[in-house]
């Protein structure tokens, strides 16, 4: 889980190892702050929980791509 001790900067110190389906993911944000020890992606799930993930992992990149496309596609 993300850690916001030095609010308002949120950092990730550990990444999930588990692959998560895009079915559970609602949105994401990238963590690129120099105040954080590593670059990260924080996924927000459909039940509003936050998960730290490694942006170098393929499933994470695929999930971000999917969410980007979902955002671009207007709902009918």
């Amino acid at each position: 889980q993300p850690d916001a001790i030095n609010a308002p900067v949120t950092c990730c110190y550990n990444f999930t190892n588990r692959k998560i389906s895009v079915q559970r993911l609602a949105s994401y944000r990238r963590i690129t702050s120099s105040k954080c020890p590593k670059e990260a992606v924080i996924f927000k799930t459909i039940v509003a929980k936050e998960i730290c993930a490694d942006p170098k992992q393929k499933w994470v990149q695929d999930s971000m791509d999917h969410l980007d496309k979902q955002t671009q596609t207007p709902k009918t």
């Epitope: 889980q1 999930t16 190892n17 588990r18 692959k19 998560i20 389906s21 895009v22 079915q23 559970r24 609602a26 799930t45 459909i46 039940v47 929980k49 998960i51 499933w59 979902q70 709902k75």
Partner: antibody
Framework: QVQLVQSGAEVKKPGASVKVSCKVS????????MHWVRQAPGKGLEWMGG????????IYAQKFQGRVTMTEDTSTDTAYMELSSLRSEDTAVYYC????????????WGQGTLVTVSS | DIVMTQSPASLAESLGERATINCKSS????????????LVWYQQKLGQPPKLLIY???TRESGVPDRFSGSGSGTDFTLTISSLQAEDVAVYYC?????????FGQGTKVEIK
């Protein structure tokens, strides 16, 4: 493709504990979110618990809290479910179940392990 | 917890007839942002583990015959077998996967009349 192979049938006395194993192949266990579901004879499916990446930890159904422990041996890609203080109502087939990307449902199941609790 | 209630408990239809199973959730399992229902259907044959048939309430898993269809939204869902075959004799379960704890319906046994 994920494959799950469970340990064999067990007969236990009331009050004892049982430990069921589930060996993963095709994936490493740490990539998966392994869960356990049981089914008493002639009854329905009952989720017991499993690793929830949204919480970052193993979560348990309230009914089994304090009596069940789910662990992982990442060196052998084997998941374990230990149930203690067994009673006759715990007689059931116990399944490990998962999917390649955690979604909240299960498309890969072990073959099941029958645990019989009898004096 | 989200409680799942299935009906009927059992049903018997003739070969080639339609079989309909209902599943009701105590809370909505519709996520409005993507308009998807977080509900799956499983088929369990005697002595076997369950097999996933349908996810997102209406999307068939690959390899599942098209006589199986899922419908419904929010709290009320239906699994339909359009033309019952001998190999469809099984118990069918719904499960919500919107939020933990993951909960199942009590099952519907489908037999041939």
């Amino acid at each position: 493709q994920v494959q799950l192979v469970q340990s064999g049938a067990e007969v236990k006395k009331p009050g004892a504990s049982v430990k069921v194993s589930c060996k993963v192949s095709g994936y490493t266990l740490t990539e998966l979110s392994m869960h356990w579901v049981r089914q008493a004879p002639g009854k329905g499916l009952e989720w017991m618990g499993g690793f929830d990446p949204e919480d970052g930890e193993t979560i348990y159904a309230q009914k089994f809290q304090g009596r069940v422990t789910m662990t992982e041996d990442t060196s052998t890609d084997t998941a374990y479910m230990e149930l203690s203080s067994l009673r006759s109502e715990d007689t059931a087939v116990y399944y490990c179940a998962t999917n390649e990307f955690w979604s909240g449902y299960f498309d890969y199941w072990g073959q099941g392990t029958l645990v019989t609790v009898s004096s | 917890d989200i409680v799942m209630t299935q009906s009927p408990a059992s049903l018997a239809e003739s070969l080639g007839e339609r079989a309909t199973i209902n599943c009701k959730s105590s809370q909505s399992v519709l996520y409005s942002s993507n308009n998807k229902n977080y509900l799956v259907w499983y088929q369990q044959k005697l002595g076997q583990p369950p097999k996933l048939l349908i996810y997102w309430a209406s999307t068939r898993e690959s390899g599942v015959p098209d006589r199986f269809s899922g419908s419904g939204s929010g709290t009320d869902f239906t699994l339909t077998i359009s033309s019952l075959q001998a190999e469809d004799v099984a118990v069918y379960y719904c499960q919500q996967y919107y939020r933990s704890p993951w909960t199942f319906g009590q099952g519907t046994k489908v037999e041939i009349k």
